[in-house]
Amino acid sequence: VPDKTVRWCAVSEHEATKCQSFRDHMKSVIPSDGPSVACVKKASYLDCIRAIAANEADAVTLDAGLVYDAYLAPNNLKPVVAEFYGSKEDPQTFYYAVAVVKKDSGFQMNQLRGKKSCHTGLGRSAGWNIPIGLLYCDLPEPRKPLEKAVANFFSGSCAPCADGTDFPQLCQLCPGCGCSTLNQYFGYSGAFKCLKDGAGDVAFVKHSTIFENLANKADRDQYELLCLDNTRKPVDEYKDCHLAQVPSHTVVARSMGGKEDLIWELLNQAQEHFGKDKSKEFQLFSSPHGKDLLFKDSAHGFLKVPPRMDAKMYLGYEYVTAIRNLREGTCPEAPTDECKPVKWCALSHHERLKCDEWSVNSVGKIECVSAETTEDCIAKIMNGEADAMSLDGGFVYIAGKCGLVPVLAENYNKSDNCEDTPEAGYFAIAVVKKSASDLTWDNLKGKKSCHTAVGRTAGWNIPMGLLYNKINHCRFDEFFSEGCAPGSKKDSSLCKLCMGSGLNLCEPNNKEGYYGYTGAFRCLVEKGDVAFVKHQTVPQNTGGKNPDPWAKNLNEKDYELLCLDGTRKPVEEYANCHLARAPNHAVVTRKDKEACVHKILRQQQHLFGSNVTDCSGNFCLFRSETKDLLFRDDTVCLAKLHDRNTYEKYLGEEYVKAVGNLRKCSTSSLLEACTFRRP
C-alpha cells in the first residue's frame, strides 16, 4: 500500500460498498501523488478500533462513547477530524447534554433523589449515560444492576427501552417503556414532553431539544437548566450550564504515526469534491443503501481537530467522568462532605521540590503533580489529573478559555484586610540599562529583548500587544534582533539569548535560567537591551536583596523605565511610566473543585502564609529565594475574588480584549484546542 493511502475501516457490507465508491471517486479527482483511500472491512467498531491500533487500518468515524473506548489502553487512538453540522459559518461539532426543569420547581442537581425523571432512552448518551454516570456515586448501593439502583434513586421514571417487568419504576411515567416513537415519551422530544406534561420533574435531553420543541421565547422562559455547581440558569445559557459537552461524530487515528495530516488532507479534498451539494454521482454525507454509512447523513462537513487535543480533552472532563463511572463502577468508600486532597500542579523539578515540602507539611491536604509547561499543567487540571495552580494573567485567560475558573488572587500589598480585598493589579514595565541612554519605546527595533515567557502578561501579552498595534504583524522575532522569550520555537531568534543547557534552552520553566521575572531581568543584566517585567522586579533583585552571584552587586539606580510617550524615568516612578496595569496572578481550578480549593488554600495560608516570620526552619508558602515557585515570592496573601469569579470578570474587559487581539499571533496549541471546544 503506498505511503499516501488512508485505510478506511468499514463495519458492514453497505459501508464497504460506500467505501469502495468513495475510493473510486477520489481516484478520479485527486492527482496520483495525492492521498488515496483503501477499504478494510471489520465486523464491528471495536474490531476497527483494534485494527487501527494494530496498524491494519488507519481511520474510522465513531460516536462519543466509542471515542472513549478508542482512547483507552491498549488502543490509544486520538480524535483527528470532527464532523460538523449546521452551517459553515457556525459549525456545530458538539452538543450539550442538559437537565431541564420547570422554573418554579425549586430543587438543584444535588437534590434529585426522590424526584421523577424523564429519559430519552436506556443506554442513550444525553438521556441516560451522562446523567446516570454523573449521579452514579449518589445512587443507593448496591449499584448493580444499574437499572434497579436508578429506580430506587428516583421516585418514578420514564426510561424507554428499559425492562418494564424487572424494573417497573423505570416505566412508571410511560407504561410499557416502548422503545420507539409509538411511546409518546420516547427520544429527545418525548423526554421533554414527559416534563412538559407534568409527568416528570426533570428531563435529560440535549440543549437543542427545548428550542426545537418551543419556538416561543416566552414558553422557553418557563424552563431552566440544572447546573453541576447546584445553581440554575436560563435554557439559552447551556454553554455555561450543562452536564457534559459531547462530540457528535469523530474520525480517530493512532496517536503515534497515525497519518493525521494525511487523513485531514484526504477528507478536506473529499468535502471539496463530494460534500454537501457538491456532486450528483457520489455524496460523502448520503447513504442510499442504509443510514449514516461511514459518516453521518446529517453532517455538513469536516473540521480538523487541533493536534494538541487528545481524547480526554476532546471528550471533556464531565463526559469522561460519567462514562468512567458507568464502566468501572468505582466510587469513594463513603461519600463525605470532607474535601479530598488538592492536587497541585508543579512546573519542573524546582517547583516540585517546594510542592513536596508543602505536601509533607500539609499533612495530607496537598498532593503534587508535575508537568513541564504551564499549558501541560492547565491540561492536567482540565482532565482531573491535577486540581489547581497559581497562574499569571495571560495563562488565566487560556485556562478560562479551557473552562477553568479563578478561585483566589495573589495580593502583593500588606493591608489590614488582605484576604478580603483583591487588588487592582501590578504594573507591566519595560526596563533598560541607564547607560543605554539613547534607547526609547520608539526605537526598540533591532534591539535584544528579554521576556518572562510567551503568553505571560508583563513579559509578553502587554508589550507584544502594544507592539502589534504599531507594526500590524506577528513577526516579533524579526522586530527584535534576538532575545529570550521562553516558550518560543527553539529555532527562533527569540530563543537565541536564552541560557538553558541542551533541551532546557528556552523552555518555559525554571530549568531555563532566563525564565520568569527574575530570569528576564538577569537576561537584561547579562545580555539584553530591554526586559519586560513587573514593577517590583528591579527592587527585588538589586541592593543585595538577591544573593545570587549575578545579582548581589546590582544597583537599582543603574536601570530606568521606558515610558510609552518616548521618555524614560527612574525605576521608582513606575506609577507614571508603565506599559499597562496587569491583573494579579490567580489560582485556577475546575468548577467542581472550586469550593474545596478555596477552603483548603485558606487553611494552608493561615498555617504557612506571610504570618510565618522565620522561613529558615518553617515551611513558607510564599517564599522561594526570588524564584517565584508555585506563587510569586512577594505574595502577602491569597484573596477572595467576591464576584470576580470568571476569567472575564477577573481579568477585566480591557485585558481580555488585548489578549484577544493578540490571539492571531498566538502559538498556544492549548488555546487552539480549547477554542475548538468552545469557539
Epitope: H350, E351, E357, V360, V363, N510, G617, N618, S624, E625
Partner: nanobody, 117 residues
Framework: QVQLVESGGGLVQSGGSLRLSCAAS????????MAWYRQAPGQQRELVAG???????KYADSVKGRFTISRDNAKNTLYLQMNSLKPEDTAVYYC???????????WGQGTQVTVSS
C-alpha cells in the same frame, strides 16, 4: 556548606528489609523538614517519604504501610526503615533538607538499593 551523607543501601531479596541513614552536618537539623527521594534509571526523582520538624510524616502511595521515616534530632540523622521490599523499589535513594533551597541542584551521592526477585 550543608552536607548530607546517605548510607545503608545494598542488595536484598524481594520481601526483605533495609534501614537507610542520612547524616547531616552544616545545618540546624532539628528545625527543618526532611525527606527521602529515590530515582530509578530513566525515571524522574520522586518523593518517597517526608517528615516535618514536629514529626508529622507523609508517604508516597507506593510505600505506605511498608516504609517508615524517622529522625533523631540529637544525632542529626534521618532514617528510612524499608520492609517488604519489592523489585520496583530498586533505585538510588537520596535524603534532602529543604532548607537548602528548592532551586539548588545539590544532592548527596545517594545510596543504591537493589531488590532482586
Amino acid at each position: 556548606q550543608v552536607q548530607l551523607v546517605e548510607s545503608g543501601g545494598g542488595l536484598v531479596q524481594s520481601g526483605g528489609s533495609l534501614r537507610l541513614s542520612c547524616a547531616a552536618s552544616g545545618t540546624i537539623f532539628a528545625i527543618n523538614t526532611m525527606a527521602w527521594y529515590r530515582q530509578a534509571p530513566g525515571q524522574q526523582r520522586e518523593l518517597v517519604a517526608g517528615i516535618t520538624r514536629g514529626g508529622s510524616t507523609k508517604y508516597a502511595d507506593s510505600v505506605k504501610g511498608r516504609f517508615t521515616i524517622s529522625r533523631d534530632n540529637a544525632k542529626n540523622t534521618l532514617y528510612l526503615q524499608m520492609n517488604s521490599l519489592k523489585p520496583e523499589d530498586t533505585a538510588v535513594y537520596y535524603c534532602t533538607d529543604y532548607s537548602r533551597g528548592y532551586y539548588q541542584d545539590y544532592w548527596g551521592q545517594g545510596t543504591q538499593v537493589t531488590v532482586s526477585s
